[in-house]
Interface confidence: low
């Protein structure tokens, strides 16, 4: 075998598994995949004492390469200290060395969302003598965070003793307030709230910005539903314009494609709302292959009373893909409701968030109005989840006691569907699962409502739930309520239909 340098991995326990009164704790360093012997493992413990033990090298059967583990035991009081394991492999090179610096234990964590909110001006657009900026640090696994305010990148001398932290369920939120004089605010400086947490830095910035968006008029553009895309194979996208003032001028909605290719014929609908405003929708059929291959579609909204055109565009969601897991449950009989039962379907850990949910009985799809399905919410992992609820009658389950919950999602294989059968009386009829694999872990859910408008909300964990790995990003759905100057013209959005 040829010379191969080792891969080095820190070995730590989960912090929650180490008793607070532990007298000693052990951490390790794994050097693996090297050839030939030997490796030299040393520990840098700073000024702290510890005992080390390096285990004899073992041979990796398939490759003939070697692996070894070195263990360091230190006092339990030092559990929060950092230690460095230094691995040298002179056969690779006389100066080959790999350092790993880590603490005794590691935590799964959900990083924070950082957002600055600012006090509003009065109705006439005039700023008060002082302006308050509020830094919201939300949705993170409880732990030490440091908040710093910056003015044009320079650290400000701010009293942070007013920062307050609250905990809701498994996640924490902190807020810090900064008060500025009107003079400072109007000077066009940038203010940044910088948060340091678990070795990473997260921040948000704000500055006074011009009010350049046409007030009151909003446009949204939907993506095709997975059901229309993969099952019906006739996907459509819809451009929705709301809060238009009825007037003599005509609202024009024009469709185009980024590729420059022609678009299909669209259908248009106008609706007068109770509050006197006008809502206009235009629905455009799109090619299944065009959409899947990443074509971008644009909707342009013009009106004589708009200072400028509104442009919205949509395309297939990018990023990692993960197929949904589907679990279906029947609720037990409830006193006084012997002739009705509720079925529930949990669909989780899918990416991206676009999903269609259907219920079937007797091989026939039930109307969408029969079931109620939540908008996708982020899990504590990197995917999304939804719940769907179906009420069934005794007549239905006595005719055939098998109901199927089906999820349509682009990552599901082989046919973009995953389904699970459920029976009201499971002892009498067994439900079978198709395209269903047991999950590696079940995640405990909490999060915020995805869609419009944004709403707070938690969710009930699965009864057998245990917490899996934490998210390595900041959760949260898009919001429309932004300063267009900051968002560079086109605010992102997600359309979930009229409320």
């Amino acid at each position: 075998a040829s010379t191969q340098s080792p891969s080095v991995f820190p070995l730590t326990r989960c912090c929650k598994n180490i008793p607070s009164n532990a007298t000693s704790v052990t951490l390790g360093c794994l050097a693996t995949g090297y050839f030939p012997e030997p490796v030299m493992v040393t520990w840098d413990t700073g000024s702290l004492n510890g005992t080390t033990m390096t285990l004899p090298a073992t041979t990796l059967t398939l490759s003939g390469h070697y692996a070894t583990i070195s263990l360091l035991t230190v006092s339990g009081a030092w559990a929060k200290q950092m230690f460095t394991c230094r691995v040298a492999h002179t056969p690779s090179s006389t100066d080959w060395v790999d350092n790993k610096t880590f603490s005794v234990c590691s935590r799964d964590f959900t990083p924070p969302t950082v957002k600055i909110l600012q006090s509003s001006c009065d109705g006439g657009g005039h700023f008060p003598p002082t302006i308050q900026l509020l830094c919201l640090v939300s949705g993170y696994t409880p732990g030490t965070i440091n908040i710093t305010w910056l003015e044009d990148g320079q650290v400000m001398d701010v009293d942070l003793s007013t920062a307050s932290t609250t905990q809701e369920g498994e996640l924490a939120s902190t807020q810090s307030e900064l008060t500025l004089s009107q003079k400072h605010w109007l000077s066009d400086r940038t203010y940044t709230c910088q948060v340091t947490y678990q070795g990473h830095t997260f921040e948000d910035s704000t500055k006074k910005c011009a009010d350049s968006n046409p007030r009151g008029v909003s446009a949204y553009l939907s993506r095709p539903s997975p059901f229309d895309l993969f099952i019906r194979k006739s996907p459509t996208i819809t451009c929705l314009v709301v809060d238009l003032a009825p007037s003599k001028g005509t609202v024009n909605l024009t469709w185009s494609r980024a590729s420059g290719k022609p678009v299909n014929h669209s259908t248009r609908k106008e609706e007068k709302q109770r509050n006197g405003t006008l809502t206009v929708t235009s629905t455009l059929p799109v090619g299944t292959r065009d959409w899947i291959e990443g074509e971008t579609y644009q909707c342009r909204v013009t009106h004589p009373h708009l200072p400028r055109a509104l442009m919205r565009s949509t395309t297939k969601t990018s990023g990692p893909r993960a197929a949904p897991e589907v679990y279906a449950f029947a609720t037990p009989e409830w006193p006084g409701s012997r002739d009705k039962r509720t079925l529930a379907c949990l669909i989780q850990n899918f990416m991206p968030e676009d999903i269609s949910v259907q219920w079937l009985h007797n091989e026939v799809q039930l109307p969408d109005a029969r079931h109620s399905t939540t908008q996708p919410r982020k899990t504590k992992g990197s995917g999304f989840f939804v719940f769907s609820r179906l009420e069934v009658t005794r007549a239905e389950w006595e005719q055939k006691d098998e109901f199927i919950c089906r999820a349509v999602h682009e990552a599901a294989s082989p046919s973009q569907t995953v389904q699970r059968a459920v029976s009201v009386n499971p002892g009498l009829a067994g439900g079978s699962a198709q395209s269903q694999r047991a999950p590696d872990r079940v995640l405990c859910h909490s999060g915020q409502q995805q869609g419009l408008p944004r709403a707070a909300g938690g969710s009930v964990p699965h009864p057998r739930c245990h917490c899996g790995a934490g998210r390595a990003d900041w959760p949260g759905p898009p919001e429309l309520d932004v300063c267009v100057e900051e968002a560079e013209g086109e605010a992102p959005w997600t359309w979930t239909g009229l409320c």
Partner: nanobody, 116 residues
């Protein structure tokens, strides 16, 4: 239309180097924190490196610290990931992610393969 486009991936030998680029369009780039993630086949997504918006503060995942460097050029709407001393376990699809407040965008990913 918001787009993130990664480039610079490819096949490289262990110990070699690659420089990934992520070009953004349709957003005010300087507002956004940039994160590189990677996902190896059959494994969960892993945070590689973060560079913040206003101050370009950087931080790294444990497995790449000391070998990878993240940077950004706001004038060119581009983020970079310089990857040195590459190892076979760095093989993955590398994704660029841009975040500002609750806005989040992903690139399509670029494949990096480290093999002799």
């Amino acid at each position: 239309d918001v787009q993130l486009q990664e480039s610079g991936g490819g096949l490289v030998q262990p110990g070699g180097s690659l420089r990934l680029s992520c070009v953004a369009s349709g957003i005010r780039f300087s507002n956004y924190g940039l994160t590189w993630y990677r996902q190896a086949p059959g494994k969960s997504r892993e945070l590689v490196a973060v560079i913040s918006s206003a101050t370009s503060t950087t931080s790294y995942g444990d497995s790449v610290r000391g070998r990878f460097t993240i940077s950004r050029d706001n004038a060119k709407n581009t983020a970079f990931l310089q990857m040195n001393s590459l190892k076979p376990e760095d093989t993955a699809v590398y994704y660029c992610n841009a975040r500002w407040r609750d806005y989040e965008y992903w690139g399509q990913g670029t494949q990096v393969t480290v093999s002799s």
